[in-house]
Interface confidence: low
C-alpha cells in the first residue's frame, strides 16, 4: 500500500484513479470500513465518519477518473489506512500525520535551550533531522534539543521527518533574543563625547521591559548602576540616572547612550542588561571604554590609556615627519626632553590604529641670565 505523510494543521490529498477516464461510483472509507465520502449520481455524499466535515473531493477531476480525497486541518488522530473503492477494486493509502512544535515560546533568549517535540501516530518510528539557519544540524526521535541557542540560530529552522522512506518538511521560525554584539569597545580621547549603541539582533512588534547599565570603572573598587530605564512598546523612558556621569539616553530603539565626556575615571567596562516582559532571563551586552590622554609636563611628554586593553596592543609616541618613535606594549609611554613639533600618540593593534591623539611640543628657550 501507498504511504503518505501529512503535517498537523495542513491539507493532504489522497489520490485514487480509475482505469477509465470517466465519472464512476467511488467511496472512501477508513480502516473500520466507515464511509467518509463518495459519489451518488453526480453528487458528493458524506458518511458518518468524524472526518467527513473536513473531507472533500475535486469534482472537476471526476470525469478524468481521478477520485481524490482532500483532508483539511489534519490531526494526528487522522493517521489511518484509507480505502478507495472504485471499479470493484480497492486502493489502500496509509496516512501518517506528524506535528512538530517548540515546547516553549519560539522567542528565546541567547543561551536558553530550544526543545522541539514530535507528535506522531502510535506505532510509527520516525526520525527527525533539523537544520538551523546557520547550518547547524541536530537529529533525534520524539524530541530534539538545542542546549544553548546562539545569535546565528535566529531564523527559519528546516526539519525533515522521515518514515518508511517518505519525508515531510516542517519550517519553524525561531527568534533568538540577543544584542547584535556580545561585546564592543569604544576608544576615545579624553574630553570627547562617547556614544554607546546596543542594537538588538531581532525585531519584535512590541518590545516592553526594563534595563540597567552597570559600570565597573578601572579606578573604582566596586561597580555602580549608571542608568535604569523602561522600554514600553519600543519607546525608552529613563527611570534613574547617576549624577556623575550624567548619561543621556535616546528615546527610540536601538538603545543609545551618550556620555558627555570621556574621562580617565570613567574608563572601564559596563554590562547592559535588558529584561523583557514575560521572559525569564536577560539580554546582556558588554561595553568597554578606553580613554587616552597625552600631556606635556616640564621636560616629560606622556601618553597614557585607561580601560580594558589587551596586552598585545601597542602604545606609541611618534614625532610627525621624523623617524622618532617610542613604542611599548604598556598603558603608558613617555619621552624625556621631547623635540619640538607635532607628536602623535597612537594606540594600535597589529598596525591598525584604534586611537590617536595629537599634542604640540613647543621649543623651550633657555632662560636668559639676569645681570
Amino acid at each position: 500500500k501507498k504511504v503518505v505523510l501529512g503535517k498537523k494543521g495542513d491539507t493532504v490529498e489522497l489520490t485514487c484513479n480509475a482505469s477509465q477516464k470517466k465519472n464512476t461510483q467511488f467511496h472512501w472509507k477508513n480502516s473500520n470500513q466507515i464511509k467518509i465520502l463518495g459519489i451518488q449520481g453526480s453528487f458528493l455524499t458524506k458518511g458518518p465518519s468524524k472526518l467527513s466535515d473536513r473531507a472533500d473531493s475535486r469534482k472537476s477531476l471526476w470525469d478524468q477518473g481521478c477520485f481524490s480525497m482532500i483532508i483539511k486541518n489534519l490531526k494526528i488522530e487522522d493517521s489511518d489506512t484509507y480505502i478507495c473503492e472504485v471499479e470493484n477494486k480497492k486502493e489502500e493509502v496509509e496516512l501518517l500525520v506528524f506535528g512538530l512544535t517548540a515546547n516553549s515560546d519560539t522567542h528565546l533568549l541567547e543561551g536558553q535551550s530550544l526543545t522541539l517535540t514530535l507528535e506522531s501516530p502510535p506505532g510509527s518510528s520516525p526520525s527527525v533531522k533539523c537544520r538551523s539557519p546557520g547550518g547547524k544540524n541536530i537529529q533525534g526521535g520524539r524530541t530534539l534539543s538545542v542546549p544553548q541557542l546562539e545569535r546565528q540560530d535566529s531564523g527559519t529552522w528546516t526539519c525533515t521527518v522521515s518514515q518508511d522512506q517518505k519525508t515531510v518538511e516542517f519550517k519553524i521560525d525561531i527568534v533568538v533574543l540577543a544584542f547584535q554584539k556580545a561585546s564592543s569597545t569604544v576608544y576615545k580621547k579624553e574630553g570627547e563625547q562617547v556614544e554607546f549603541s546596543f542594537p538588538p539582533a531581532f525585531t519584535l512588534e512590541k518590545l516592553t521591559g526594563s534595563g540597567e547599565l552597570w559600570w565597573q570603572a578601572e579606578r573604582a573598587s566596586s561597580s555602580k548602576s549608571w542608568i535604569t530605564f523602561d522600554l514600553k512598546n519600543k519607546e525608552v523612558s529613563v527611570k534613574r540616572v547617576t549624577q556623575d556621569p550624567k548619561l543621556q539616553m535616546g528615546k527610540k530603539l536601538p538603545l543609545h547612550l551618550t556620555l558627555p565626556q570621556a574621562l580617565p575615571q570613567y574608563a572601564g567596562s559596563g554590562n547592559l542588561t535588558l529584561a523583557l516582559e514575560a521572559k525569564t532571563g536577560k539580554l546582556h551586552q558588554e561595553v568597554n571604554l578606553v580613554v587616552m590622554r597625552a600631556t606635556q609636563f616640564q621636560e616629560n611628554l606622556t601618553c597614557e590609556v585607561w580601560g580594558p586593553t589587551s596586552p598585545k596592543l601597542t602604545l606609541s609616541l611618534k614625532l610627525e615627519n621624523k623617524g622618532t618613535t617610542v613604542s611599548k606594549q604598556a598603558k603608558a609611554v613617555w619621552v624625556l626632553n621631547p623635540e619640538a613639533g607635532m607628536w602623535q600618540c597612537l594606540l594600535s593593534d597589529s598596525g591598525q590604529v584604534l586611537l590617536e591623539s595629537n599634542i604640540k611640543v613647543v621649543p623651550t628657550w633657555p632662560t636668559p641670565v639676569q645681570p
Epitope: 516592553t208 512598546n233 519607546e235 516582559e277 525569564t280
Partner: antibody, heavy 118, light 111 residues
C-alpha cells in the same frame, strides 16, 4: 504559588530604628522588583522605595531618603527594609509588594505593624 | 510627584446596584497609547488586592463586574452590580512616574 511573608509586629521608641523582613517564595527571587508601601492607621497608601534583588540596587522615595535602607539576601530570598530616626507619624502597617510589569503591585505581603510610641 | 485625587470619599450603594468611583491625576498618566492607572481593593486587616491595571485590564481571577475606564487624567472604576463581598476601600494608583502614587481611597458600603 507566589508568597511574600513578613516579620512580626514591632513596638519602637522615637529615635530608634526598625528592620522589617519579607521572605519571597514561589518564583525566581532575582527576577522581580520588590517595593515597600506603608499605610498609617486609617490612612492611604504610600510608596517608600524599591529594590532590585538581582543587583541589590535600591531606589527610594525622596520623602524617605536618608532614613530608609533596603537590602536583600539572595541566599534566603529575603528583602529587608530598615527605617531609622523613627517618629510617632511612622506608626503604620508596612507592606512589601512584588511588581508585575512596571510599578503595579500584584503580590503583597501580609503587612507588619510598626508602632512608634514613647 | 503626580497627585491622585479620588471621589467620593465614601459611597453607599444598594445590593445589585452600580457603584462608580472617580480618580483624577494632577497630570496625564498616558504613555504611548496606554494609561498607566491601576485600581486596588482593600478589605479590613488585609493587604490591597490588584483589580485593574493599565486603566481597563482585569487582573486574573477578578470578577467581571469590575471594570475600569478613562485616559489622560480622568479615570473611573465601576462595579456593575454590587455584592456584599465588595464592601471595601478602593484605591487608584498611577504607575507612569516614580514615585508611584495612590489616591486617598473610597469606602464602599451597602445602603
Amino acid at each position: 504559588q507566589v508568597q511574600l511573608v513578613q516579620s512580626g509586629a514591632e513596638v519602637k521608641k522615637p529615635g530608634a530604628s526598625v528592620k522589617v523582613s519579607c521572605k519571597a517564595s514561589g518564583y525566581t527571587f532575582t527576577a522581580y522588583v520588590i517595593s515597600w508601601v506603608r499605610q498609617a492607621p486609617g490612612q492611604g497608601l504610600e510608596w517608600m522605595g524599591e529594590i532590585y534583588p538581582g543587583s541589590g540596587s535600591s531606589y527610594y522615595n525622596e520623602k524617605f531618603k536618608g532614613r530608609v535602607t533596603m537590602t536583600r539576601d539572595t541566599s534566603t530570598s529575603t528583602v529587608y527594609m530598615e527605617l531609622s530616626s523613627l517618629r510617632s507619624e511612622d506608626t503604620a502597617v508596612y507592606y512589601c509588594a512584588r511588581s508585575g510589569d512596571g510599578s503595579r503591585f500584584v503580590y503583597w505581603g501580609q503587612g507588619t505593624l510598626v508602632t512608634v510610641s514613647s | 510627584d503626580i497627585v491622585m485625587t479620588q471621589s467620593p470619599d465614601s459611597l453607599a450603594v444598594s445590593l445589585g446596584e452600580r457603584a462608580t468611583i472617580n480618580c483624577k491625576a494632577s497630570q496625564s498618566v498616558d504613555y504611548d497609547g496606554d494609561s498607566y492607572m491601576n485600581w486596588y481593593q482593600q478589605k479590613p486587616g488585609q493587604p490591597p488586592k490588584l483589580l485593574i491595571y493599565v486603566a481597563s485590564n482585569l487582573e486574573s481571577g477578578v470578577p467581571d463586574r469590575f471594570s475600569g475606564s478613562g485616559s489622560g487624567t480622568d479615570f473611573t472604576l465601576t462595579i456593575s452590580s454590587l455584592q456584599a463581598e465588595d464592601v471595601a476601600v478602593y484605591y487608584c494608583q498611577q504607575s507612569l512616574q516614580d514615585p508611584p502614587t495612590f489616591g486617598g481611597g473610597t469606602k464602599v458600603e451597602i445602603k
